[in-house]
Interface confidence: medium
């Protein structure tokens, strides 16, 4: 099993059987009357993993997911029949697939489901303290889920709940055609993206939403949506998908005369993840699948990890690209995409940009406007017709940090852990695939910090049957990884140091930042331990220097 080969060959390849036998995976194989364990909410404080599934919401113990509580939340036979009458599949569509599961306050979660093509939301009581052991549905308080959850369980939703307001990227209609980014709940009127305007959103598939501070002034906070969508006509010859990052100001309350109850600060930019190909033609990984934000030191500047796949059916490939928020902000401060008519090319807008610059949040920091409702008409008019930026966001170092093209699987999910090792800090990526495997990859700086080498440490099969991984969460407290799929939920430790072998050289060659030779075994490395007794070399994996004495 242990291999010391090229970087694209895993150091360790573990089958599901081997994972079980070595006590490296705990699986919850689902309930007979449920499926689709896709919606995760990690609560480190309570030591719980909340999972939304078909007709159920689970609360798993982070220590061992075999210990769980469940809420049954099906649809009434009325809704089920109505859905069936609409020609939908009774098992795959006419049920309550949980799509939104967020912390609402200290004592409640907010959950939304498809409700058999009749979206519905409610609150879940979880108590003040973990020891309260409360996990129950607020049966008396159901809300319309339109604009929060899609009708169709096959559709993706991205959501974020902050300060009692829910931001959702979803489809707001039965047919799955009216896609929008919404803000609902709270005391204000719901806000959404412009309807039926492909310049704003063009059949998007939403991935995730994140709050990122722009400055020390909370008035400048922005919500960023990651999604993929059809390229706008003229932007690309033929039908193509583009990966996108969209921004919205948290304090956007829509326009006064125009864009009433619509976002006035919405902007989007393309995310590029490509490799130079032969004949100077780049190979693009455009199908954004997942995003992970690595917050470290400065919450205003997280590193964005994106998982991408190719659009082509002929050439199957996956990649991971990293983006810096400074590059993202630079693009949003750059030229807007403009064209004079449907048959014209998109060009950078050269005219006068109205003040305050569209996309700027109303605050004391960047201008004298207290509210988006006070924005001048020319700003609103410009914002309505110029939602896209001309320049794309390029990845750090202008290329992916991980590429896989010669395999029978594609990447679906990513989580990243920053690990302290003997010779510095390393980002360890856990990448989920569409065949139920998890790749553990470390990116190692070469000469410069941004010039990275990828080392594939492990390839682990975490489900009995090949099934696409659709959700992943990492608990730094528990040092565990939690994985969701249609079939169930799996839990595995972030490290399996003992499996690397019984000798110092093997441990050192593994180049796993979690592991070091302690003199007698390959075990978990803790930076606080005495340096002399720990043998580890992540950067070079050189056993001669570290294991010779």
């Amino acid at each position: 099993n242990y291999q010391n080969g090229k970087n694209n060959v895993p150091r360790l390849k573990l089958s599901y059987k081997e994972m079980l036998e070595s006590n490296n995976v705990i699986t919850f194989n689902g309930l007979a009357n449920s499926s689709s364990y896709h919606t995760f909410l990690l609560d480190e404080e309570r030591s719980r993993l909340y999972v939304g599934a078909k007709d159920h919401i689970f609360s798993f113990d982070l220590v061992n997911i075999k210990d769980f509580q469940k809420i049954v939340w099906p649809v009434s036979y009325t809704r089920r029949d109505e859905c069936k009458w609409a020609g939908k599949d009774i098992l795959k569509e006419c049920a309550n697939f949980i799509k939104v599961l967020k912390a609402y306050n200290q004592t409640h979660l907010y959950a939304c489901g498809t409700g058999a093509f009749h979206p519905i939301c409610t609150y879940i009581e979880i108590g003040h303290h973990p020891e309260d052991n409360i996990f129950k549905l607020e049966n008396s308080h159901f809300e319309n889920g339109r604009g929060k959850s899609p009708y169709d369980p096959k559709l993706l939703t991205a959501s974020l709940l902050i300060d009692g307001e829910l931001y959702s990227g979803t489809a707001a209609d039965f047919m799955g055609r009216d896609f929008a980014i919404f803000r609902t709940l709270g005391h204000h009127h719901p806000i959404r993206t412009e309807q039926h305007d492909s310049r704003w959103l063009n059949d998007p598939k939403f991935i995730s939403a994140h709050l990122i501070s722009e400055s020390d002034n909370p008035e400048d906070d922005k919500v960023y949506f990651f999604f993929r969508e059809n390229a706008i006509d003229g932007e690309h010859s033929g039908k193509a998908t583009h990966a996108r990052i969209g921004q919205i100001c948290k304090n956007d309350f829509g326009g006064h005369r125009s864009l009433v109850n619509k976002w006035t600060t919405f902007l989007k930019a393309r995310l590029i993840c490509s490799v130079p190909g032969p004949n100077g033609i780049d190979t693009h990984f455009d199908e954004l699948q997942d995003v992970f934000l690595m917050n470290f030191k400065d919450p205003k500047n997280p590193v964005v990890y994106g998982v991408f796949t190719t659009s082509s059916n002929i050439f199957k490939g996956s990649a991971v690209c990293m983006y810096s928020m400074s590059d993202v902000r630079r693009v949003f401060l750059g030229p807007y995409a403009h064209r004079d008519g449907p048959n014209y090319q998109w060009v950078p807008y050269q005219g006068r940009v109205p003040y305050p610059r569209p996309g700027t949040c109303p605050s004391k920091t960047f201008g004298g406007f207290d509210s988006t409702k006070d924005l001048p008409d020319d700003v609103i008019t410009f914002a309505r017709s110029h939602p896209a930026m001309y320049n794309p966001v390029f990845p750090m170092n202008n290329r992916p940090i991980v590429i896989k093209t010669d395999v029978n699987y594609q990447f679906t999910q990513i989580v990243v852990d920053r690990v302290d090792a003997e010779d510095g800090q390393y980002d360890v990526m856990f990448i989920g695939t569409d065949v139920g495997t998890v790749l553990k990859v470390v990116s190692i700086p070469k000469e410069t910090w941004y010039d990275l080498e990828e080392v594939l440490l492990e390839e682990m099969t975490v489900f009995r049957e090949p099934t696409a991984i659709s959700a992943m969460e990492l608990s730094t407290k528990q040092q565990q990884l939690y994985i969701g799929s249609t079939a169930g939920v799996a839990q595995l430790p972030l490290h399996r140091c003992d499996i690397y072998g019984k000798a110092c050289a093997e441990c050192c060659l593994a180049r796993d930042p979690y592991c070091a030779w302690d003199g007698s075994a390959c075990s978990r490395y803790f930076p606080t331990a005495k340096r002399r007794t720990r043998r580890q070399d992540i950067r070079n994996g050189d056993p001669l220097t570290h294991c010779s004495d």
Epitope: K84, W85, H118, F174
Partner: antibody, heavy 116, light 110 residues
Framework: EVQLLESGGGLVQTGGSLRLSCAAS????????MSWVRQAPGKGLEWVSW????????YYADSVKGRFTISRDNSKNTLYLQMNSLRAEDTAVYYC?????????WGQGTLVTVSS | QSVLTQPPSASGTPGQRVTISCSGS????????VSWYQQLPGTAPKLLIY???HRPSGVPDRFSGSKSGTSASLAISGLRSEDEADYYC???????????FGGGTKLTVL
Amino acid sequence: EVQLLESGGGLVQTGGSLRLSCAASGFTFSDYAMSWVRQAPGKGLEWVSWIYYDSGSKYYADSVKGRFTISRDNSKNTLYLQMNSLRAEDTAVYYCAKLNGDFDYWGQGTLVTVSS
Amino acid sequence: QSVLTQPPSASGTPGQRVTISCSGSSSNIGNNDVSWYQQLPGTAPKLLIYADSHRPSGVPDRFSGSKSGTSASLAISGLRSEDEADYYCGAWDSSLSGYVFGGGTKLTVL
């Protein structure tokens, strides 16, 4: 108390048009699918059409497809049936019914007579 | 010709038990819930039984529904004169993508 009140029926020539309305009260109209069912004089019940709670989906019996259009205005708690190209066999009492996995509440009906 | 088949008439004396049958196919009764409706003379239909055997509130427990395979039946025990009405069975038909009714059964209380 749930109430459904149909209106708009009457005598019309073959090939003519009529628009039926159904005013709903006593329940959250926007939460339920609604339907039209008809009954020809001395005959049994025949389902005509139904509409999803948010107008997202509409369904018709083969006998009226292409001629009848169901719609609703949730802000007015009203269901409509636009009937075009009417035929003698469309003569019937038209009932508006609330859908709840079945037709759990019915209006009193409005008579539509199509004369040749 | 109705998709669901009911006997055109049925009768019974007060206090008696009467059963009305409704037969269909796998695309309607076989795989979907059956409802029963009562239509008193000169009035609109009223839901009597839903989901094969459930009674809405207000419907006396003298009325009961059952289903087996592609057939359903409505039983009325302790027959009363006010039960004299037309009774219709109904179900969603998956292959027709529409709701279908039986032709109706006229119940006479002798």
